[in-house]
Interface confidence: medium
């Protein structure tokens, strides 16, 4: 805590400017009016205050707004935002996308801090859903943002927001997250024609079921191996050799290099060796000729 001392004669601040940067802690506390600070917050970020001084300025704002800062102040916090704790931020009511952008700019180029995570959480909860403009903004600053959300949180993303998602935004998503996002993407892109649709849906296919992969195999999409390797194993296993060949097109040759990795390895184990041989890739490990394949899951369903 900064001790309360009288402001020396002639030092009372009439505006927030660079003349304050050589005020000692106690002089800042005594000579800067909190209300003046609040109305001239836009100046603070342009003045080279030290961290020690920023602590004093924050303390003054905390005293003025014990229930949380108003948005007019929050929008102009600048690098004073870095002095805020998640507890401070939980008191805020941030509704303007411009305010969010201004604060994210301060943290730009750095990993998401606990302050930023709390700010985003407050903002999204205040809006009720993750709309397109918000998602656009968040993924621009943090490409991995979507994949940091739980499947439950992702369920509040409206299909219209999916248009803002870029392939790199999904790089760190796990299958559970893609399971939630894929149906939204399918809905969002449903009116596009075949080749354009595939370009858009490709990054989401880690959440696609078998029947959708079968449908894609009929559309000459030429899926690359990197995309194929991210597909759900349980969705790939029922595909026939012919369907995989159609799905991959000229990229089918890449299966050889991936034959020891999932889902290719598990898929090979489910195919007849005769069928695999038709690919001419030397894939081994299929079901030998003359063996009967029992689908136990089907048998259980019937009984």
């Amino acid at each position: 805590e900064v001790e309360k001392t009288a402001c020396p004669s002639g030092k009372k601040a009439r505006e927030i400017d660079e003349s304050l940067i050589f005020y000692k802690k106690w002089e800042l506390e005594a000579c800067v009016d909190a209300a003046l600070l609040a109305t001239q917050m836009d100046r603070v970020n342009a003045i080279p205050f030290t961290y020690e001084q920023l602590d004093v300025l924050k303390h003054k704002l905390d005293e003025l707004y014990p229930q949380g800062y108003p948005e007019s102040v929050i929008q102009h916090l600048g690098y004073l935002f870095l002095k805020m704790s998640p507890e401070d931020i939980r008191k805020w009511n941030v509704t303007s996308l411009e305010t969010l952008k201004a604060l994210l700019e301060v943290n730009k180029g750095h990993e998401m801090s606990p302050q930023v995570a709390t700010l985003i959480d407050r903002f999204v909860k205040g809006r009720g859903q993750l709309d397109k403009d918000t998602l656009d903004t968040l993924t621009a600053f943090y490409p991995g943002y979507l994949c940091s959300l739980s499947p439950e949180e992702l369920s509040s993303v409206p299909p219209s927001s999916i248009w803002a998602v870029r392939p790199q935004d999904l790089d760190t998503c796990d299958p559970r997250q893609l399971d939630v996002l894929y149906p939204k993407a399918r809905l969002a892109f449903q009116n596009m024609n075949g080749s354009e649709y595939f370009v858009k849906i490709q990054s989401f296919l880690g959440g696609a079921p078998t029947e959708d992969l079968k449908a894609l195999s009929q559309q000459n999409v030429s899926m690359d191996l990197a995309t194929f390797m991210k597909l759900r194993t349980d969705a790939v296993l029922p595909l026939t050799v012919a369907e995989v060949q159609k799905l991959l097109g000229p990229h089918v040759e890449g299966l050889k290099a991936e034959e020891r990795h999932r889902p290719v390895r598990d898929w090979i184990l489910r195919q007849r060796q005769d069928d695999l041989d038709t690919l001419g890739l030397g894939l081994q490990g299929g079901i030998p000729n003359g063996y009967l394949v029992l689908d136990l899951s089907m048998q259980e369903a019937l009984s």
């Epitope: 505006e15 927030i16 400017d17 660079e18 003349s19 940067i21 050589f22 836009d42 100046r43 970020n45 342009a46 003045i47 080279p48 205050f49 030290t50 961290y51 020690e52 001084q53 920023l54 690098y79 870095l82 301060v106 943290n107 730009k108 180029g109 750095h110």
Partner: antibody, heavy 126, light 107 residues
Framework: QVQLVQSGAEVRRPGASVKISCRAS????????IHWLRQAPGQGPEWMGV????????????AYAQMLQGRVTMTRDTSTRTVYMELRSLRFEDTAVYYC???????????????WGQGTLVTVSS | DIQMTQSPSSLSASVGDRVTITCRAS??????SAWYQQKPGKAPKLLIY???TLQSGVPSRFSGSGSGTDFTLTISYLQSEDFATYYC?????????FGGGTKVDIK
Amino acid sequence: QVQLVQSGAEVRRPGASVKISCRASGDTSTRHYIHWLRQAPGQGPEWMGVINPTTGPATGSPAYAQMLQGRVTMTRDTSTRTVYMELRSLRFEDTAVYYCARSVVGRSAPYYFDYWGQGTLVTVSS
Amino acid sequence: DIQMTQSPSSLSASVGDRVTITCRASQGISDYSAWYQQKPGKAPKLLIYAASTLQSGVPSRFSGSGSGTDFTLTISYLQSEDFATYYCQQYYSYPLTFGGGTKVDIK
């Protein structure tokens, strides 16, 4: 790439003044401050002051280290992206290499120096 | 003013050695410290800021640690180009101050 280019070496008599320039080139779009530091032979750098090199919401008036107050003035010419440091009433102990250096405003408050000028040797000699 | 006291003031080392330089602030400065390398006739070069963050383009053999009053610069495997003088700096409060330097020379 940012470059800070300083004016050449100066020799002055005690009591005289010297004015050094520092011109920024390259990508100077990032918001930053320009600081002046000096380094006497065999010593560590000594911070002299800071100036906002562009006009902005703040007044743009510079701030100086108290040990130099009254003798130093920092100014800027925004049209040429040049800042100046004038030191008056020179003393023998002001003999040093004078540097301008940049600090960026952003993630953190701006007080470590990511780019430096090449230095200007000021010799005070009778 | 905050004093930054560096130790040792000089040290001799060989290529491949692990070198540690320490800096003590006269009062707590959180993690608002930086480290610079300076070679004769050249300006200082930023190595580390925020006590432990490596500046872009600086080799990973340099690392920094510490918080509060005690800070350390470590060179994990000394290279021939690392023989120089190293300075710590605090940027918690004005005036910004530097340590007296540590000269690292060849054994």
